[in-house]
């Protein structure tokens, strides 16, 4: 797919609006910032991750 | 093979300075956060300072705010904590740590995944 | 700054007993809490991430649940290499917060 735009623009300690990340980072809300991200690797328990880096970016976690 | 070392503490006096190193080696420090931990003898754990080493962008705890700075240099792949005008309080094990962030429907599911072995400050006269 | 509270301080068990450490945050932090182990003289090790994830390489009898405020660890079946001190972190907001610790010890 398309890549995003990385947005570097987000310093708010407070802000909710989503930052849009190239396609293998995600928002890190601690930072506030587009960092390297992985896919879920917990082989040892029933949670699972379909989603791809980068998708259904809301920086309400971390 | 994810790897932090770090060096530099030692013993200082009251109102002395030292710098931390933290070299990484198996991933790139710009990809990630970087964070400076800190344990005094017998306590828990205190977050110092974080640094996004692809911007510099930072943050740091209250308690060391206006006298530490943590830095990073990706050429070196290394981060650094600048202790200045250093107190009693100061005496601890100082980690650092990678940040490793996993995709959510949230963005980042994130947390301190690799450590380093710690280095020693200790803060007398 | 968001305060992380874990309870018990400390507690004392045997080998193959089932062991829970809660943690309270002060105000809601969504999933985002993770828990370390750490031994004597050692770093802290990773456990569970964004709540109830388990890390790579960290044994099943370990598990993490909660959300918003109130979290626990729970060690299905206590081993004899389990025997250390345990913190939660919040990472909602910065600055990241750590609980005061529970040390697990032998009964």
């Known amino acids: 797919g398309a890549r995003r735009l990385r947005v570097r623009s987000q310093r708010s300690r407070d802000s909710s609006v989503p930052t849009q990340c190239n396609q293998t980072e995600c928002f890190d809300p601690l930072v506030r910032n587009c960092v390297s991200c992985e896919l879920f690797h917990t082989p040892d328990t029933g949670h699972t991750s379909s989603l791809e880096p980068g998708t259904a970016l809301q920086p309400q976690e971390g | 093979e994810v790897q932090l070392v770090e060096s530099g503490g030692g013993l200082v006096q009251p109102g002395g300075s030292l710098r931390l190193s933290c070299a990484a080696s198996?991933?790139?420090?710009?990809?990630?956060?970087i964070h400076w931990v800190r344990q005094a003898p017998g306590k828990g754990l205190e977050w110092v300072a974080w640094?996004?080493?692809?911007?510099?962008?930072?943050d740091y705890a209250d308690s060391v705010k206006g006298r530490f700075t943590i830095s990073a240099d990706t050429s070196k792949n290394t981060a650094y904590l600048q202790m200045n005008s250093l107190r009693a309080e100061d005496t601890a094990v100082y980690y650092c740590?990678?940040?490793?962030?996993?995709?959510?429907?949230?963005?980042?599911?994130?947390?301190?995944?690799?450590w380093g072995q710690g280095t020693l400050v200790t803060v007398s006269s | 700054d968001i305060q992380m509270t874990q309870s018990p301080s400390s507690l004392s068990a045997s080998v193959g007993d089932r062991v829970t450490i809660t943690c309270r945050a002060s105000q809601d932090v969504s999933t985002a809490v993770a828990w370390y182990q750490q031994k004597p003289g050692k770093a802290p090790k990773l456990l569970i991430y964004s709540a109830s994830f388990l890390y790579s390489g960290v044994p099943s009898r370990f598990s993490g649940s909660g959300s918003g405020t109130d979290f626990t660890l729970t060690i299905s079946s206590l081993q004899p290499e389990d025997f250390a001190t345990y913190y939660c972190?919040?990472?909602?907001?910065?600055?990241?917060?750590f609980g005061q610790g529970t040390k697990v010890e032998i009964k």
């Open positions: 198996g991933f790139t420090i710009s990809s990630n956060s």
């Open positions: 640094i996004t080493p692809s911007d510099g962008n930072t």
């Open positions: 972190q919040q990472s909602y907001t910065t600055p990241p917060t």
């Open positions: 740590a990678r940040r490793v962030c996993y995709s959510s429907v949230r963005g980042c599911a994130g947390a301190m995944d690799y």
